[in-house]
């Protein structure tokens, strides 16, 4: 069954700046991605960018940079100041779709653990999500 | 896995009205905007309409402005399109899909560019 990772964290020199990294553990190949974030329980969700293989990136604001790292996983990086910066119960979803297999999300928060004057750490554990 | 399942199509007489609703699951569906697309026999993928996370904002294809209406109930993670006045032309599979094809244009659209997919639903308009 495929599966997608999401690490979310909290970078040390911006307090405000969040970096969201998402994979796909599959065997297809990748059609399209779509990062959202929101509060928690599907409150007051939006679209942060959308990635796809050949038509090219599409972001929103506080979105500053996405990005495809390899052909199965991206990364965000997001810049937020006042309403629009991210809270530590933030949720940030990511959704691959796999034309015609199918699309699978996994969503992620900051670690309860982050300090804001401390970076996470370096390889955070995925969390999964195969729905 | 996310599943998107449409459902309220049929065969119905022009001027008539239908109602199509899109059941969702396996994913946050109050985070994504979402979408009607249509088939008819024959040709390409249309777009029809989208409408936003919160549902603060919908738009329309002009060929069905005035007639359908989008709506979504997050709470039920439904999406609907409520569509009156039918007409011979509005003949097609409608498909349910995540995403705002407008992202990166409406030429050669296909089910490949969007986040989800539904299985479609037939759309009749005979008399």
């Known amino acids: 069954t495929p599966e997608v990772w999401v690490q979310v964290r909290m970078e040390a020199t911006e307090l405000s700046s969040f970096t969201i990294r998402c994979g796909f553990l599959g065997s297809g190949s990748i059609s399209l991605v779509t990062v959202s974030w929101g509060g928690p329980n599907g409150a007051g969700g939006t679209t942060l960018a959308v990635l796809h293989p050949e038509r090219g990136i599409r972001q929103w604001a506080p979105a500053r940079q996405a990005r495809w790292e390899t052909q199965s996983s991206i990364s965000l990086i997001l810049e937020g100041s006042g309403a629009s910066s991210p809270c530590a119960n933030t949720t940030f979803c990511c959704k691959f779709a796999s034309f015609p297999e199918g699309s699978w999300e996994a969503c992620g928060s900051l670690p309860p653990s982050s300090d804001p004057g401390l970076s996470a750490p370096p390889t955070p554990a995925p969390i999964l999500r195969a729905d | 896995e996310v599943q998107l399942v449409e459902s309220g199509g049929g065969l119905v007489q022009p001027g008539g009205s239908l109602r199509l609703s899109c059941a969702a699951s396996?994913?946050?569906?109050?985070?994504?905007?979402m979408s009607w697309v249509r088939q008819a026999p024959g040709k390409g993928l249309e777009w029809v309409s989208t409408?936003?996370?919160?549902?603060?904002?919908?738009s329309y294809v002009d060929s069905v402005k005035g007639r359908f209406t989008i709506s979504r109930d997050n709470t039920k993670n439904t999406l609907y399109l409520q569509m009156n006045s039918l007409r011979a032309e509005d003949t097609a599979v409608y498909y349910c899909?995540?995403?705002?094809?407008?992202?990166?244009?409406?030429?050669?659209?296909?089910?490949?560019?969007?986040?989800?997919w539904g299985q479609g639903t037939m759309v009749t308009v005979s008399s």
């Open positions: 396996g994913f946050t569906f109050s985070y994504y905007d």
């Open positions: 899909v995540e995403g705002d094809p407008h992202n990166f244009g409406l030429e050669s659209l296909s089910l490949r560019d969007f986040g989800s």
């Open positions: 409408i936003n996370s919160n549902a603060g904002r919908t």
